[in-house]
Structures are given as structure tokens and as C-alpha cells.
């Protein structure tokens, strides 16, 4: 229904706390360089204005769209051109072009320092002094670094953060209480960020239809007892929610997400038997819980899919006269029978099925032609299954760090032109798939591995898009979203690459490395490894292992030495010489 004042409507629906949080996220995602205080001031102004509209919907400007109101606020920021360059040009446009322009200027890799967590005591002090400001800082810092973070989900993580601080700041040993809990939230939030970015990429590059297909497959796996109409309704609603969030319409997105959660909880009988525990929770926890609820038990008595989609003589008639419903039903039926497949794989199979019908239904004897389609799925299914087995075996053998290194070598060979920081970030993230997925039961490994890898590779593509340097990467990134992971997996050593010259300074280290946290140490070593591969792309695994073992030994020795600086300055050049010899 239409509301006289959109801003009053959303304020009433969401309540002041969530309204303010979402406006702060929106501003932080659009203008990523502004300070917290600048954004907090704008948020307060918008909130005060919203309250005047709640009091009187006919008040001046209350009938304006949210994009107009928010855009006007952003464009009124002083020194916009000095700080944001051409983003300021957006302000010369009218809505909806102005909002589109803001969206296009979102930076997936803003040059901001890493979000450093203060030490426990300081954190607890500032949290106790002003919890609202503290949480505002959290929302601002995460949102500006992750401009596509799913806003209602970020509110959920802020709530988690709040609960952890409330609990741990009351304890004697605040540090040991906070660190593992906040690390857990951070890890989950980072995964949530890359997953959501993938959804927005799908929406931006391939439109709502592609996202809806993703949603149908995912929902059919989770709710195999829901019928096709129910799945279609949920997929349509979920598509709307994600379209809004990806489009910067965060208030509408959060409101519609709450509505969807309400609908699901009111219709559990026709959706799933597993929803009750989620539905007993308060709003943010409920929506989060529903988004990752366990799969319902598969219905008994599912007949073979072949009857309707392969053996039927009327397949081509059904396809021609009801294309979307027929293909949608195929995807639904296949997905509900295969919770053990990744969504990417299910979409590849649906695409293969569609292509087969397009070809066969134009032939003289269609049933003979499409009759083998399910057998043709086999290699498509085997490929990711083999990938999971190979990689999980490797992970179990090497552990997370060793596995990351193996991936780093592999990907540096595939795309040596890509910047070392990007390769290291990608390899570290890809390597986490082992810890995340390889410990799961067999039937959960494939969906976990492939859908996670796809999300990470999407980030690789986004970063590469900014400064394209590798034809290999461009080729894989310009194809369809579901084909990316197989495309990257199939890449081999880039034969066109001219090896980098050996620069001694790249492999020169100083004693400051000794005091770095373990994670930073690993990154330094992995940076060196990537550079080695760029110097010798065809180095064997043995050669690289020799060099890296030598390197690790060198660090260990010098970091234990009484005079670290002398050790680094004398042993360092020797290490460089040995490395060159080992790779000669």
C-alpha cells in the first residue's frame, strides 16, 4: 500500500534504534571515507526529520522518496569533491540516476587501514561509557569497508557484539573472554560479507531472474516439503529483499526481510518442520536463524525425476508452452532431491537441461535426443566431487596454513600478473575452505566448498575488474557466475607470462617481523612465496618447499638470536643466495 510519507512509514515499522542503525550503514556504505562523527551528525538530522514526519505526514518534504532525502543529505556534505573526486558529479544528477551513480562509486577495496580491535580494557571502558556510540562505530567501520554488507544482518552482528561485550566486560579476565568470541563473530561476518557481495554481483550482472533461480535452488534444498508455489513465493520475496539491499534501499530491505520472517513463521506447516526454534527468537536473531536453518527431512515417496523431464513424450510441448514454470519446476524438483549438491552445481545442471531442450526440441526426434540428458549430467557432477575430495585430502595432509600455501602457488601460476596482496588475500580466503568445510559430514562438503569458493572468487573478479591485468582472470570472470569456479579450477600455468626479475629486496627481512602477530608473519611469508613463484612460475613443489623451509628456519634462528638485527643483516643475504641457487 502507498504511504503519504515513506520515511515516516519506515521509521514506524523499524523503530528508532534499527532506523538509525540502517541509515548509518547506508551513509557509511555510500561515502566510505567520511568519519563516524560526520555520519553520526547526518543520521541524527535524518532521524529528527523522520520524527517530524511521524508527527505530521503532510509536513514539508515528508512526501519525498528516501533516495531523494538521503541523496540530498549526502550531496550537502562540505568538501565532497575534494574528498571523493568524481563521486561529487553524482550530485548533478536527478533521482533515480543519482542513486545509480552513488552505487557505481562504491569501492569494494577502499584504502582504509585494517579495522584494529582495541585491547580489552580500553574496549570495555568505551563500551560502558556509551554503548550506543560504541556500536555506532562498529556499524560505521564495518559498513565502510564492506559497502555491500547485508544491512539487517550487520545489525544482527552488532547485536552479537553488544551481547559479548556486556558479558565479557563483567569478567575478571576480559581478554580471554572477548578474544575467541569476537574472533568468531568477525569470521562469520567476513563470510557473510563475501556471500552477500556474490548475491549483489548476481543481481547487478545477470538481473533478478538469475538471483531468483539461485533462491529457488537454495530454498528447495532447505525446504524440500514445501511445494513449488510456496518456494516460488519465498524466492520472489527473497529476491525483492536482496534487490533492495544491493540497491542501497536499506530501510525497505530490512522491513521486507522482517515481513518475510513473519510470513515464514506464520506458515511453518507448509514450509518446514525445522523453523520453530528460529521463530521463538526476537527479530534480528529470528531472521538470521531462518537464513541458515538446517534442511528439513526430505519427503518420502519422491518418484524419479526422469518420468516428467526425460521420459515424457510431451517434454517439448510443456517446455515450449510454459518455459519458465517447466524449467523452474525442474530446478525445484532436482534441488529438493539433492541437498548434497552446491547451488552452483544445481544451476549448471538446470542450464545444461535447458540447453539440451533448446537443441533437441528443434530436431526430428526430440525424445531420442533429450533421452540421455541425465546421463550427460554425470561429468558435471563428478568434477566438483573430485575437487572436494582432492582439496580436502590436501587440507587434511597440510593443515590450513600449508593448504593456503599450496593454493597460493597454484593461483600465482594461473594468474601471475595479479598483484601479490590480492593473490595472498585470495589464497588465504580460499584456504579457509578446508577448516570451514572439510570437517563437515560427507553430504555437506560439496555445497559448503563450492558455494564458498564461488563467493571468494567473486571477490577476486571484483578486485581484478578495477585493474585488469590477467587474460586468464578476465576470461573466467566474464562468464556466468556459476561457471567461474570450474573455469578457475581448470586454469593452468600462464604460458604467456614473462617471469619477474629476481630482486633481493623483495626477499630481505628485518627483525621487526619477529614481533608481528602470527597472522601477519604468515602474510609476510606468503608474500615472499608468491614473489618466488612470479620469479620462477615453473618451479617444482619440491624446490618451493626447500626454499620455504629454509626461509622458516632462517626466521626461527634470527628471531631467537640475542642480536636479531645482526642475524638478519648477515644471514639474510645468505638466504637470498641459497634461494637463487635452489631455484636455478
Amino acid at each position: 500500500e502507498a504511504h503519504k510519507s515513506e520515511i515516516a512509514h519506515r521509521y514506524n515499522d523499524l523503530g528508532e534504534q534499527h532506523f538509525k542503525g540502517l541509515v548509518l550503514i547506508a551513509f557509511s556504505q555510500y561515502l566510505q571515507k567520511c568519519s563516524y562523527d560526520e555520519h553520526a551528525k547526518l543520521v541524527q538530522e535524518v532521524t529528527d526529520f523522520a520524527k517530524t514526519c511521524v508527527a505530521d505526514e503532510s509536513a514539508a518534504n515528508c512526501d519525498k522518496s528516501l533516495h531523494t532525502l538521503f541523496g540530498d543529505k549526502l550531496c550537502a556534505i562540505p568538501n565532497l569533491r575534494e574528498n571523493y573526486g568524481e563521486l561529487a558529479d553524482c550530485c548533478t544528477k536527478q533521482e533515480p540516476e543519482r542513486n545509480e551513480c552513488f552505487l557505481q562509486h562504491k569501492d569494494d577495496n577502499p584504502s582504509l587501514p585494517p579495522f584494529e580491535r582495541p585491547e580489552a580494557e580500553a574496549m570495555c571502558t568505551s563500551f560502558k561509557e556509551n554503548p550506543t556510540t560504541f556500536m555506532g562505530h562498529y556499524l560505521h567501520e564495518v559498513a565502510r569497508r564492506h559497502p555491500y554488507f547485508y544491512a539487517p544482518e550487520l545489525l544482527y552482528y552488532a547485536e552479537q557484539y553488544n551481547e559479548i561485550l556486556t558479558q565479557c566486560c563483567a569478567e575478571a579476565d576480559k581478554e580471554s573472554c572477548l578474544t575467541p568470541k569476537l574472533d568468531g563473530v568477525k569470521e562469520k561476518a567476513l563470510v557473510s560479507s563475501v556471500r552477500q557481495r556474490m548475491k549483489c554481483s548476481s543481481m547487478q550482472k545477470f538481473g533478478e531472474r538469475a538471483f531468483k533461480a539461485w533462491a529457488v535452488a537454495r530454498l528447495s534444498q532447505t525446504f524440500p516439503n514445501a511445494d513449488f508455489a510456496e518456494i516460488t513465493k519465498l524466492a520472489t520475496d527473497l529476491t525483492k529483499v536482496n534487490k533492495e539491499c544491493c540497491h542501497g534501499d536499506l530501510l525497505e530491505c530490512a522491513d521486507d526481510r522482517a515481513e518475510l520472517a513473519k510470513y515464514m513463521c506464520e506458515n511453518q506447516a507448509t514450509i518446514s518442520s525445522k523453523l520453530q526454534t528460529c521463530c521463538d527468537k526476537p527479530l534480528l536473531k529470528k531472521a538470521h536463524c531462518l537464513s541458515e536453518v538446517e534442511h528439513d527431512t526430505m519427503p518420502a515417496d519422491l518418484p524419479a525425476i526422469a518420468a516428467d523431464f526425460v521420459e515424457d513424450q510431451e517434454v517439448c510441448k510443456n517446455y515450449a508452452e510454459a518455459k519458465d514454470v517447466f524449467l523452474g519446476t525442474f530446478l525445484y524438483e532436482y534441488s529438493r532431491r539433492h541437498p548434497d549438491y552446491s547451488v552452483s552445481l544445481l544451476l549448471r545442471l538446470a542450464k545444461k537441461y535447458e540447453a539440451t531442450l533448446e537443441k533437441c526440441c528443434a530436431e526430428a526426434n526430440p525424445p531420442a535426443c533429450y533421452g540421455t540428458v541425465l546421463a550427460e549430467f554425470q561429468p558435471l557432477v563428478e568434477e566438483p566431487k573430485n575437487l572436494v575430495k582432492t582439496n580436502c585430502d590436501l587440507y587434511e595432509k597440510l593443515g590450513e596454513y600449508g593448504f593456503q600455501n599450496a593454493i597460493l602457488v597454484r593461483y600465482t601460476q594461473k594468474a601471475p600478473q595479479v598483484s601479490t596482496p590480492t593473490l595472498v588475500e585470495a589464497a588465504r580466503n580460499l584456504g579457509r575452505v578446508g577448516t570451514k568445510c572439510c570437517t563437515l559430514p560427507e553430504d555437506q562438503r560439496l555445497p559448503c566448498v563450492e558455494d564458498y569458493l564461488s563467493a571468494i572468487l567473486n571477490r577476486v573478479c571484483l578486485l581484478h575488474e578495477k585493474t585488469p591485468v590477467s587474460e586468464h582472470v578476465t576470461k573466467c570472470c566474464s562468464g556466468s557466475l556459476v561457471e567461474r569456479r570450474p573455469c578457475f579450477s581448470a586454469l593452468t600455468v600462464d604460458e604467456t607470462y614473462v617471469p619477474k626479475e629476481f630482486k633481493a629486496e623483495t626477499f630481505t627481512f628485518h627483525s621487526d617481523i619477529c614481533t608481528l602477530p602470527e597472522k601477519e608473519k604468515q602474510i609476510k611469508k606468503q608474500t615472499a612465496l608468491a614473489e618466488l613463484v612470479k620469479h620462477k612460475p615453473k618451479a617444482t613443489a619440491e624446490q618451493l618447499k626447500t626454499v620455504m623451509d629454509d626461509f622458516a628456519q632462517f626466521l626461527d634462528t634470527c628471531c631467537k638470536a640475542a642480536d636479531k638485527d645482526t642475524c638478519f643483516s648477515t644471514e639474510g643475504p645468505n638466504l637470498v643466495t641459497r634461494c637463487k641457487d635452489a631455484l636455478a
Epitope: A229, L302, A307, Q313, E314, N318
Partner: antibody
Framework: EVQLVESGGGLVQPGGSLRLSCAAS????????MNWVRQAPGKGLEWIGH???????YYATWAKGRFTISRDNSKNTVYLQMNSLRAEDTAVYFC??????????????WGQGTLVTVSS | FELTQSPSSLSASVGDRVTITCQAS??????LAWYQQKPGQPPKLLIY???DLTSGVPSRFSGSGSGTDFTLTISSLQPEDFATYYC??????????FGGGTKLTVLG
């Protein structure tokens, strides 16, 4: 509760018409191929036709022309329009749900049936 | 296609092993179902895809076959099993066919 309820049966004269309804509850009828099957007194089951999730109707050869299947998703109801009725159309008419959107079988869910008697 | 079910009637005793066959005039792969019907009731699905037992149906019922020849077996007849049995071939959108039925009655 998931169920199908037929209605609209009764006594009709030869040459007359009748529209049977099958109301679904507990599930969305638009997701399934909905079939009509009949059974003459003391005889076997005879498939009439179905309407699938793509709104395409198919009929047994003998039923084409005289029988029409349609549905109203907003009412969650499927219909069987029967014209030029003959004495041999006297039977219990069942509606049955296909296993999926494009399935003619198997039928796990049936209505209780509605009796149509064609007689002068 | 047509389905020929045999026998059309059959008398047996409680505890007997009973077999009903269904023959299709052309191959229908495994797309065959078996139903049980009692007077005044709609049919009840027992077996689908030739050999898959519907949930809730006792394991004494079993189905076999593929292509053109199919069998329903009741390993040890119980009093509640006396009814009429139908096979159904569901080979495609425009063709689903029922067999003529087999009436199973108590011997003597």
C-alpha cells in the same frame, strides 16, 4: 490438513452438462498436475485428463472434445466441465494430485469422489 | 499404450503369497504404480516407480519389473488385504493408463 474435496455431482439428463469442482486445502494446487479419474459402477479406473503447473491440459483420447479441465488458482480449485453427457458417463469422478507439476502419476492424494448419474 | 492386468480375479487365504502381473503394450521403463481399492473408497497408492514402497505401506507388499512386465507381490496375505488392485502406467503427459484391476477375495 492436506486434502481434496470434489463437488458438483448429481443427476443429469443425457445431452446435458455438468461442472465438477475439486477444492484443495493444505497445499497450493498450482504446484501440481491435477488429474481427473472416473470409475463406472462395478468397473475399473479410467483416466480422463489433467492440467499441469504450466496450465496445459491433456486428455485421454476418448475424452477430447467433450471434457475440459481448468483451474482457478485464487480459489485453489480445479474443474471438470462435462458436455453432451451420455448414460455411459455415469460414474464416480475422482480428482487426484500428480507427484509434481508435470506428473501424470503416481497419485498419492485422492479426493473421496463425487457421483455423476446420467439418466432420463 | 495399454496395460493388461492378470488375473482379473483371484481367491486366496490369509498367509498365502500372492502375485499379480501387469503387462504394458510398450516399454514404460519403471513408470508403474500399484493401487489398492476398497469399496466406497478412493484408491490408495502402494508402490510407485515399479518397486518403491510408499511410506506407511506394510513391507509385505513389493513390486518388481521394468520395461513391459511388472509384478505386485503380497508375501503373506492379511485379512485387510482383500480388495481390488490396479496397476497404473504413467509414461507421459498425454498418456496415463490403468490396468483392468484384480479382485482379490477370500478363498472358500
Amino acid at each position: 490438513e492436506v486434502q481434496l474435496v470434489e463437488s458438483g455431482g448429481g443427476l443429469v439428463q443425457p445431452g446435458g452438462s455438468l461442472r465438477l469442482s475439486c477444492a484443495a486445502s493444505g497445499f497450493s494446487l498450482s504446484s501440481y498436475a491435477m488429474n481427473w479419474v472416473r470409475q463406472a459402477p462395478g468397473k475399473g479406473l479410467e483416466w480422463i485428463g489433467h492440467i499441469n503447473a504450466g496450465d496445459i491440459a491433456y486428455y485421454a483420447t476418448w475424452a477430447k472434445g467433450r471434457f475440459t479441465i481448468s483451474r482457478d488458482n485464487s480459489k485453489n480449485t480445479v474443474y471438470l466441465q462435462m458436455n453432451s453427457l451420455r448414460a455411459e458417463d455415469t460414474a464416480v469422478y475422482f480428482c487426484a494430485r500428480g507427484a509434481g507439476g508435470f506428473s501424470t502419476g503416481p497419485f498419492k492424494l485422492w479426493g473421496q469422489g463425487t457421483l455423476v448419474t446420467v439418466s432420463s | 499404450f495399454e496395460l493388461t492386468q492378470s488375473p482379473s480375479s483371484l481367491s486366496a487365504s490369509v498367509g498365502d503369497r500372492v502375485t499379480i502381473t501387469c503387462q504394458a503394450s510398450e516399454s514404460i521403463n519403471s513408470r508403474l504404480a500399484w493401487y489398492q481399492q476398497k469399496p466406497g473408497q478412493p484408491p490408495k497408492l502402494l508402490i510407485y516407480d515399479a518397486s518403491d514402497l510408499t511410506s506407511g505401506v506394510p513391507s509385505r507388499f513389493s513390486g518388481s519389473g521394468s520395461g513391459t512386465d511388472f509384478t505386485l507381490t503380497i508375501s503373506s496375505l492379511q485379512p485387510e488385504d482383500f480388495a481390488t488392485y490396479y496397476c497404473q502406467g504413467y509414461g507421459g503427459s498425454s498418456t496415463t493408463t490403468f490396468g483392468g484391476g484384480t479382485k482379490l477375495t477370500v478363498l472358500g
